[in-house]
């Protein structure tokens, strides 16, 4: 593109030239695609509310757990097992948690009367020892409950363990009680208060609306808007058994989904509750299944600080609030429509693919000859020709050759390397269809020339018999009228071309050659047609007529303007034209690539 541009270049508009194919099949395919795409676009627009500007929810949660549990604990007092009944209320079984979570204790293990002193470790694989060598002073094992003194002491009977400085007696490594001590927590209820806000839409609401019956209990179908949940029901919804989970503890998700349509004409903004087990129920024993933690109750006895260590098992409920609020927005609608417009081009892509496929050489040579039902598809070759214009890259090596005894044109796109152009095979290219309208521009003399005496008025064919080869005609000449090239050795092979591939009459002997190419009257008409006020001296006139004759021959024999630009004239034609319109002095320059 040129570097400088004028003001008029700015005020331009380019558009594509299209080919309209009148075809029932392709018309049906086009409308089928358009209808399907339009239906999908409209469906997606409405169902996904893509005309809305959506904003994520901002939320706060507050919970209250209610319920009383009776616990039967088995304790050992002075070597005697006793069953102790105790009542647990909200303060006993819930613990303050950060974030949108609450915890309900379902099981526990107590180690009472711990104080800081030296004592043997609880026997485990890591703490059992046979001598002091199995313990190390100052060693702190991550699994241990204290700091080793380096001594191996008797724990009980003949069992010896490493002595530690710790809260003694050491907590026993034992399984959580079965069934869970607070198994009745299944009947506890939790009230969830959830306030939400969509600041971008200036809209606030909550899950508890005025007039709600607060004696309700959530039910998936019968009471889906009730914010009071029975813990056992939550587990039933996820397909888990509360009593099983209560033993080791677990994590349960309560999901509150707000899908709010804030448009006045379709306003809807209510929560949907769902539940999901969040801990891994398949975890093996070595990876600490369930959910537990330890906490201690500290007290003083005889001025000695003591504690009761409680390993608490329970269920942590995580409340997960998510969702969006959407409101009509013209920009979103325009953006969506813009993003879907490209889909309507799919029909064109698909139909072009069919035309290109069915007009390929593969179909022509391998499918159409054998498959009779595929024959109607041949029409695609016609569509393809109308749709596509093939252009060959105009390399310096590009040349077109036309033999009078061949129906096609040969494209030679290679260096000759000393070989005669006559002998180079090249690639066969179909001859462009003759546009007879061009003939109407020629002078009338060409159309109604009186018959030449002694010749019949029918179309004259080239004389069948071969013109006897003159002694001067080169080896590559087949018509007997060619002359050797006068160009230097390196360029000579370009002019070593005959008008025929096989021996026969020369094209220069045809009447049409004389009328189209050699007629001074026609050539002058063509030159004046281009430049009406052309006035030239004899030598320059000859030069103009000669080049016009070359052009006439190229256009006549090659048809397409693009091919004519790269057409190589046969030697016989070239020399016949030069004979008619000679150069007064100097050598003829020969073919030059136009680009």
């Amino acid at each position: 593109m040129p570097a400088c541009c004028s003001c008029s270049d700015v005020f331009q508009y380019e558009t594509n030239k299209v080919t309209r194919i009148q075809s029932m099949n392709y018309g049906t395919i086009k409308w089928f695609f358009h209808v399907i795409i339009f239906s999908y676009v409209c469906f997606a627009l409405v169902s996904d509310k893509l005309y809305q500007r959506k904003e994520p929810v901002i939320s706060s949660v507050h919970t209250k757990v209610k319920g009383i549990a009776e616990v039967k604990e088995e304790i050992v007092e002075n070597g005697v097992k006793k069953l102790v009944h105790s009542v647990f209320d909200t303060a006993d079984y819930t613990f303050p948690l950060q974030g949108n979570s609450f915890f309900v204790m379902t099981n526990f293990l107590k180690t009472e009367g711990q104080e800081q002193r030296l004592c043997p470790e609880y026997p485990t694989r890591r703490t059992l020892c046979s001598s002091d060598r199995g313990c190390k002073k100052g060693w702190m094992d991550p699994q241990s409950k204290g700091i080793q003194t380096g001594r191996c002491v008797v724990y009980e009977g003949n069992q010896k363990t490493c002595e530690v400085s710790a809260w003694c007696p050491i907590e026993a490594v034992e399984e959580a009680p079965r069934p869970a001590l607070l198994n009745s927590a299944e009947n506890f209820t939790v009230l969830i208060k959830n306030n939400i806000d969509f600041p971008g839409h200036n809209y606030t609401t909550r899950n508890i609306l005025p007039g709600l019956n607060i004696t309700c209990t959530f039910h998936k179908t019968q009471n889906p808007q009730c914010p009071i949940f029975r813990l056992g029901d939550i587990f039933r919804e996820t397909g888990d058994n509360f009593s099983d989970v209560a033993i080791q503890g677990g994590i349960m998700g309560i999901e509150i989904y707000w899908d709010c349509n804030l448009d006045r004409w379709f306003h809807h903004c209510r929560p949907k509750y769902s539940f999901r087990r969040l801990d891994d129920k398949t975890t093996n024993v070595s990876l600490y299944p369930g959910y537990n933690f330890r906490y201690a109750k500290y007290y003083k006895e005889n001025n000695v600080e003591k504690r009761t260590l409680i390993k608490v098992f329970g269920i942590r409920f995580d409340i997960l609030v998510f969702g969006t609020g959407g409101k009509f927005d013209i920009i979103q609608l325009v953006v969506y429509i813009g993003s879907t417009l490209s889909y309507f081009g799919l029909a064109a892509v698909f139909i072009d693919f069919l035309i290109d496929t069915y007009s390929s050489n593969c179909c022509r040579s391998h499918i159409y000859p054998w498959c009779k039902c595929c024959q109607p598809c041949v029409v695609n070759e016609y569509y393809y020709r109308k749709k596509c214009e093939s252009i060959v890259e105009p390399k310096p090596t590009l040349k077109y050759v036309s033999f009078v005894d061949e129906s096609h044109i040969r494209m030679v796109n290679q260096q000759l390397l000393g070989r005669s152009l006559q002998d180079v095979k090249g690639q066969e290219v179909p001859r462009p269809a003759m546009d007879f309208t061009d003939l109407s521009r020629l002078p009338l003399a060409l159309h109604d020339t009186p018959p030449i005496p002694g010749q019949p008025e029918e179309i004259q064919l080239l004389r069948k018999e071969a013109t006897p080869r003159s002694r001067d005609s080169p080896v590559w000449c087949q018509c007997g009228s060619c002359l050797p090239s006068q160009l230097p050795e390196s360029h000579r092979c370009l002019e070593e071309l005959c008008c025929r591939k096989k021996p026969g009459a020369c094209i220069t002997t045809s009447e049409l050659f004389r009328k189209l190419v050699l007629s001074r009257h026609v050539l002058q008409f063509l030159l004046l047609y281009q430049e009406p006020l052309l006035a030239l001296d004899v030598d320059s006139t000859n030069s103009r007529l000669r080049h016009c004759a070359y052009r006439c021959y190229a256009t006549w024999r090659f048809g397409s303007q693009d091919m004519a630009d790269f057409a190589i004239l046969p030697s016989c034609c070239r020399w016949r034209i030069r004979k008619e319109f000679p150069k007064s002095e100097g050598q003829y320059s020969g073919f030059k690539s136009p680009y």
């Epitope: 890591r126 020892c129 046979s130 060598r133 199995g134």
Partner: nanobody, 129 residues
Framework: EVQLVESGGGLVQPGGSLRLSCAAS????????MGWFRQAPGKEREFVAA???????DYGDSVKGRFTISRDNSKNTVYLQMNSLRPEDTAVYYC???????????????????????WGQGTLVTVSS
């Protein structure tokens, strides 16, 4: 679950050498600390040698300098090379394995029989002229 099979035991003259092998089943062999223990008739089981999953070794006081423990993880096998054997080395030799997947066994604990979860059937070594 790991199965351990000892081999290489037999009768040997004092001052002689013997090489015991212990083949372990299971793909996680490289995560186990392996040990050799022995038990003479009427005596307690005694620590001989051990090698952790990361290659550190420990030997019983009575065998230091004479016995060498090694392992070949590609063959899932642990070896005990016994040189300069004495009549008091006569015993049933047991191979043992301790899982170190969730944490390494401290070096000072390698000699503790309590650390080892899996045990072989034993192979008899008799040192006699």
């Amino acid at each position: 679950e790991v199965q351990l099979v000892e081999s290489g035991g037999g009768l040997v003259q004092p001052g002689g050498s013997l090489r015991l092998s212990c083949a372990a089943s299971g793909r996680t062999f490289r995560h186990y600390a392996m040990g050799w223990f022995r038990q003479a008739p009427g005596k307690e089981r005694e620590f001989v040698a051990a090698i952790s999953s990361y290659g550190s070794t420990d030997y019983g006081d009575s065998v230091k300098g004479r016995f060498t423990i090694s392992r070949d993880n590609s063959k899932n096998t642990v070896y005990l090379q016994m040189n300069s054997l004495r009549p008091e080395d006569t015993a049933v030799y047991y191979c043992a394995a301790a899982d170190e997947t969730l944490g390494a066994v401290p070096n000072f604990r390698l000699h503790e029989k309590y650390e080892y979860e899996y045990w072989g059937q034993g192979t008899l070594v008799t040192v006699s002229s």
